[in-house]
Amino acid sequence: LPRWRQQWSGSGTTSRFPETVLARCVKYTEVHPEMRHVDCQSVWDAFKGAFISKYPCNITEEDYQPLVKLGTQTVPCNKTLLWSRIKDLAHQFTQVQRDMFTLEDMLLGYLADDLTWCGEFNTFEINYQSCPDWRKDCSNNPVSVFWKTVSRRFAETACGVVHVMLNGSRSKIFDKNSTFGSVEVHNLQPEKVQALEAWVIHGGREDSRDLCQDPTIKELESIISKRNIRFFCKNIYRPDKFLQCVKNPEDSSCLSGI
């Protein structure tokens, strides 16, 4: 008889999760020479140890501490790119601008990007049927706690001028409840971060409004300024042209505004 298993509202662990994490780790360490010392089996053991046999609504940041230590990486000053609700463009940008890094360009972010995982209390099994949903079940679930933990650490270690890409098509361009708004903003270290520069990405081709004047951007400016970090904002009216100009900065059309 199959064991009774708790039904959660969210989708279950991504199929072949252990194999995927291990394969991603091996690939990452092959491509990034500075991470060649990383033992991917230990990384998987630490990842697994954070959620296996644990009640999936009672996960803590401490559970991920071994993984965070094993996956330690530093980003050079001025090279951190945060993003909120505009992941694809942020990743397209760092794929072209190879010296800038989002969290998903770092080992731990790369391992977990787009994956779901959870276990069950007192068994060594991975739950492939369902996992807790952040809204409907609980916030202290393995996936949410992981991203909160690594996002906090990513922001804590940033230095110089930090950039953030924001989605200008959303009703709340800056959302206090996003990972950026609730975790990263509050963990930038004023003694190391001189400024936060927001890039507001416009959606419509004919949209010429100055979205840097949006009330939510002003709210972000206020939060950042109160933390003794300078704030700058730029409109990116043409994201397609923006990416093209990152690829080919000498292009004559790139001398005009983007």
Partner: antibody
Amino acid sequence: QVQLQQSGAELVKPGASVKISCKASGYTFSNYWIEWVKQRPGLGLEWIGDILPGSGTTNYNEKFKGKATFTADTSSNTAYMQLSSLTSEDSAVYYCAGYGNYLWFTYWGQGTLVTVSA
Amino acid sequence: DIQMNQSPSSLSASLGDTITITCHASQNINVWLSWYQQKPGNIPKLLIYKASNLHTGVPSRFSGSGSGTGFTLTISSLQPEDIATYYCQQGQSYPYTFGGGTKLEIK
């Protein structure tokens, strides 16, 4: 090969401060945590805390907060630990350990003996 | 903080004996336990990491086992150079903590 070279023994007066250094060689200093460990004469090992030189991020054992302060100079590949308001309880050998970002301590410095005495 | 209870605190054995040192963690530390050897007047040296992995250059007579909260270090065929104090250490969570040590003497 990986080496951690610590500064020499120190004799200091109660209430004073001391700064111990740990110079790393044989690896990329900024990328790896440096751990600090205390050993009092005839007693066991105590973890004080650690620092990631590349970012300056630190973790301290609650017991040593206010007592130990970690810094690092990436230009000279040197980590420092300052101990303040010294008492006889602080008389000990202090070790730095590091390399690998592991959850264990692979390479150790030779230790720095700090003696607090009037 | 996670407490590491190591036993025995001292141990006397004969050359060629097999000895076992145990370490008990106050909470689950998965496999994040390492063992160190410290000879008199020397620095600690890593013997075993991740509960059972032998560090480079360490003789195969040393072995480690366990996971969760219970761990053991075994030295088979005791040699004179094994006279030392042995410590366990957990790396599961900050602050990292060590066992109190086991002083090994030869009869």
